[in-house]
């Protein structure tokens, strides 16, 4: 029960985290204009990974995409890559984890397979979360560096004639969304890995032992499966680690592909 809960919670937390990573990646407010130096600006600038925006005094917002690849800073490209890798890994992880969920039966999938899938998805979520956190942190570091550089050189001349205050940028909402989402995905991944341990069938330490009785011969072998049917039909030997507690007889009944318990 605890394993199912841990796995289910891990899945939900990861799902929320990946949704957050996607949201952060799409958001325009990765960096926002620092208003400390110019609190009365009628023109508010903010930038995302894909476009930069300006909100004017009219309330009108104009956004322009970065219609170049080569002209963009390498760091921005790296952040984009990290976020996309995080989303892709997370999406695959979600897909894998759906089939790995203990509460969902798919055919006669072995629990060992579910355990492996749970571990795989958990690792994917961990890497996805780390990618998002890394991406956001790289961008934040880039902002801090640029912020202090522009502070040191606050006034830049336009053609040596006009003195204009250089726009400084600070952390936007997307950074906080990204950090939280990455953290959630990471936590979800760890929970999936923990759940995997509970799902994996424990190895028995005893060897196969043959018991000889008069009239009937039954060999009990490790793994919990009946070797013969000598004791009659009312004896049903169950796999102790099967959440669905399915018997041999049930295996023969060809369950539907998705049998929800």
């Amino acid at each position: 029960m605890a394993v199912t809960a841990c796995q289910g919670l891990g899945f939900v937390v990861s799902l929320i985290g990946i949704a957050g990573i996607i949201a952060a990646t799409c958001m325009d407010q990765w960096s926002t204009q620092d208003l400390y130096n110019n609190p009365v600006t009628a023109v508010f600038n903010y930038q995302g990974l894909w476009r930069s925006c300006v909100r004017e005094s009219s309330g009108f917002t104009e956004c322009r995409g970065y219609f170049t690849l080569l002209g963009l800073p390498a760091m921005l490209q790296a952040v984009r890559a990290l976020m996309i890798v995080g989303i892709v890994l997370g999406a695959i992880g979600l897909l894998v984890s759906i089939f790995a969920l203990k509460c969902i039966r798919i055919g006669s999938m072995e629990d060992s397979a579910k355990a492996n899938m749970t571990l795989t998805s958990g690792i994917m979520f961990i890497v996805s979360g780390l990618c998002a956190i890394a991406g956001v942190s790289v961008f934040a570091n880039m902002l801090v560096t640029n912020f202090w550089m522009s502070t040191a050189n606050m006034y830049t001349g336009m053609g040596g004639m006009v003195q204009t205050v250089q726009t400084r940028y600070t952390f936007g909402a997307a950074l906080f969304v990204g950090w939280v989402a990455g953290g959630l995905t990471l936590i979800g991944g760890v929970m999936m890995c923990i759940a995997c341990r509970g799902l994996a069938p424990e190895e028995t330490n005893y060897k196969a032992v043959s018991y000889h009785a008069s009239g009937h011969s039954v060999a009990y072998k490790p793994g919990g499966f009946k070797a013969s049917t000598g004791f009659g039909s009312n004896t049903k030997n169950k796999k102790i680690y099967d959440g669905g507690a399915r018997t041999e007889d049930e295996v023969q009944s060809y369950p539907s592909k998705h049998d929800y318990v």
């Epitope: 204009q33 110019n38 009365v40 600006t41 009628a42 023109v43 600038n45 930069s52 300006v54 004017e56 005094s57 009219s58 309330g59 009108f60 104009e62 322009r64 336009m158 006009v162 003195q163 204009t164 205050v165 250089q166 726009t167």
Partner: antibody
């Protein structure tokens, strides 16, 4: 087409308050800020402030901060500007304006402050 | 507050001639975020509200004749009417659209010579 229709002329006594309305049509009312500008007879233009009907946020010229109040009613796409403690030098035509670069203006409301 | 200074106060130009007026701001109106200058030009005729001509220093509003053009950057801006028509007689205002409070120039009165 975009239209801003303002309320009619008002005559007020010094110390009184006036509330001018600006009914918008032809665009999504909550998408743009509504600015208020006044023009004293034979004088230039003076910005009073704006209201964002979308979130109710506002920004005032410090000169009017303690006397001007801007509100909006999104259900009837109308913005209001109330000016209290009127003085004789508040006699002016009050305009509402919106759109990019203040592309659209109301016809103006003449407020006369006289004892 | 940004102070907007227009010159000349009044201007008389013959029909068909070029009319040029200036607007200077006490601070730069240049926004480095999108490399645009936030200055607006209006035309106002007696008894009417101002009419938008140019925004962002050089972008003509829709429906404005192409004889009107705006130029300049930073603190110095110019409105040019390439060939003056009788209907262009009006007062022209420039406005700071970059920083609150939004401020207007004193206006340039354009007349026919």
């Amino acid at each position: 087409q975009v239209q801003l229709v303002q309320s009619g002329a008002e005559v007020k006594k010094p110390g009184a308050s006036v509330k001018v309305s600006c009914k918008a049509s032809g665009f999504t009312f909550t998408s743009y800020n509504i600015h208020w500008v006044r023009q004293a007879p034979g004088q230039g233009l003076e910005w009073i402030g704006y209201i964002s009907p979308g979130n109710g946020g506002s920004n005032y010229n410090l000169k009017f901060k303690d006397r001007a109040t801007m509100t909006s009613d999104t259900s009837i796409s109308t913005a209001y500007m109330e000016l209290s403690r009127l003085r004789s030098d508040d006699t002016a035509v009050y305009f509402c304006a919106t759109g990019r670069g203040f592309a659209y203006w109301g016809q103006g409301t003449l407020v006369t402050v006289s004892s | 507050d940004i102070v907007m200074t227009q010159s000349p106060d009044s201007l008389a130009v013959s029909p068909g001639e070029r009319a040029t007026m200036s607007c200077k701001s006490s601070q730069s109106l240049f926004n480095s975020g999108n490399q645009k200058n936030y200055l607006i030009w209006y035309q106002q005729k007696p008894g009417q509200p101002p009419k938008l001509l140019i925004y962002r220093a050089s972008t003509r509003d829709s429906g404005v004749p192409d004889r009107f053009s705006g130029s300049g950057s930073g603190t110095d801006f110019t409105l040019t009417i390439s060939s003056l028509q009788a209907e262009d007689v009006a007062v022209y205002y420039c406005q700071n659209d970059y920083s609150y409070p939004l401020t207007f120039g004193g206006g340039t009165k354009l007349e026919i010579k």
